[in-house]
């Protein structure tokens, strides 16, 4: 790598990837095994994240990128960058503090993580229950008596599923 | 960042209470149980129990009832170990850790540790 | 409540040399769930706790591959391939299955 020959800050030709390694007059030197720089300029490179235990690693880290981590089966990401692998549950149930907990009646969660949702409430747009919810599955929605003609929109589809705001322990 | 800070050493005198305070940042404590860890001098570890600061719902190690008490604020983003009648027994360091089976983060997190000396 | 029972008290090992810490529990971890929460903690010398490995054989982030945790039932194991002189401290196996928590009476690692 070339000796940097800027009159402000020498270290600043140093490319993403390498640092600027003060023991050797401020050469260029690259990022060694494990570690990274993703800017220009940098007077040390960062040790690559470690995807281990219930992390994965999604993306290998590079020269001048971090490595990215997901979560095993069974369980899924929370938190920004994936800080946090959190324990799936089956349909129809939460985690809750002490664990997987059933949906209570009334509610239901069609996926492994989230929340219990309560059913639509099909009176509210005038609607009747045309088949009724469970803990995996909200109710669908049909028409009322008074829209039973011909050409009626006869289901309404379910709210889409939110995230939790918080993860339980 | 994720970090429990926990208040600073106390010298009480026998008889007296303390109260411990864990204030986390970088996470809300009320999605977590508390967990409240003793360390008496060259000891090993010692379970004294949990919170869960969303409801104030306690569960204690049976020869801490009445020893402990754990409360939390959740404004605050604090966790509080009270400890009455002291006696020597008491010496210790007591760690707050929000240890879950069901999330598990990227670094495990243990409180700073405050150190208790019961002596007249 | 479920104790945990550690062996051995203290172990001397040269650098570079393996070591092994065995952790026996006076009831099965396995939850009903199908999940074993043991973990092993090192608490270094006037340090906080550090946890090393959960669900008995998960290692955490920035711990070294030469730890290895294994086991199930009652019986778990802690290894190390190779130990370092960073490796010191107290290690203590926990379990999270039952109520109360209970922790191993702890396992002093010295370097010879």
């Known amino acids: 790598f070339e000796r940097t020959r800027s009159l402000q800050d020498p270290c600043s030709n140093c490319p993403a990837g390498t640092f600027c390694d003060n023991n050797r007059n401020q050469i260029c030197s690259p990022c060694p095994p494990n570690s990274f720089s993703s800017a220009g300029g940098q007077r040390t490179c960062d040790i690559c994240r470690q995807c281990k235990g219930v992390f994965r690693t999604r993306k290998e880290c590079s020269s001048t990128s971090n490595a990215e981590c997901d979560c095993t089966p069974g369980f899924h990401c929370l938190g920004a960058g994936c800080s946090m692998c959190e324990q799936d549950c089956k349909q129809g149930q939460e985690l809750t503090k002490k664990g997987c907990k059933d949906c209570c009646f009334g509610t239901f969660n069609d996926q492994k993580r989230g929340i219990c949702r309560p059913w639509t409430n099909c009176s509210l747009d005038g609607k009747s229950v045309l088949v009724n919810g469970t803990k995996e599955r909200d109710v669908v929605c049909g028409p009322s008596p008074a829209d039973l003609s011909p050409g009626a929109s006869s289901v309404t589809p379910p709210a889409p599923a939110r995230e939790p705001g918080h993860s339980p322990q | 960042e994720v970090q429990l800070q926990q208040s600073g050493a106390e010298l009480v005198r026998p008889g007296a209470s303390v109260k411990l305070s864990c204030t986390a940042s970088g996470f809300n404590i009320k999605d977590y149980y508390m967990h409240w860890v003793k360390q008496r001098p060259e000891q090993g570890l010692e379970w004294i129990g949990r919170?869960?600061?969303?409801?104030?719902?306690?569960e204690y190690v049976p020869k801490f009832q009445g020893k402990a008490t754990m409360t939390a604020d959740t404004s605050s983003n604090t966790a509080y170990l009270q400890l009455s009648s002291l006696t020597s027994e008491d010496t210790a360091v007591y760690y707050c850790?929000?240890?879950?089976?069901?999330?598990?983060?990227?670094?495990?997190?243990w409180g700073t540790g405050t150190t208790v000396t019961v002596s007249s | 409540d479920v104790v945990m029972t550690q062996t051995p008290l203290t172990l001397s090992v040269t650098i570079g040399q393996p070591a092994s810490i065995s952790c026996k529990s006076s009831?099965?971890?396995?939850?009903?769930?199908?999940?074993?929460?043991l973990n092993w903690l090192l608490q270094r010398p006037g340090q906080s706790p550090k946890r090393l490995i959960y669900l008995v054989s998960k290692l955490d982030s920035g711990v070294p591959d030469r730890f290895t945790g294994s086991g199930s039932g009652t019986d778990f194991t802690l290894k190390i391939s190779r130990v370092e002189a960073e490796d010191l401290g107290v290690y203590y196996c926990w379990q999270g299955t039952h109520f109360p928590h209970t922790f191993g009476g702890g396992t002093k690692l010295e370097i010879k």
């Open positions: 919170i869960d600061p969303e409801d104030g719902d306690t």
């Open positions: 009831q099965s971890l396995l939850d009903s769930d199908g999940k074993t929460y």
């Open positions: 850790t929000p240890y879950s089976n069901y999330v598990y983060w990227y670094f495990d997190v």
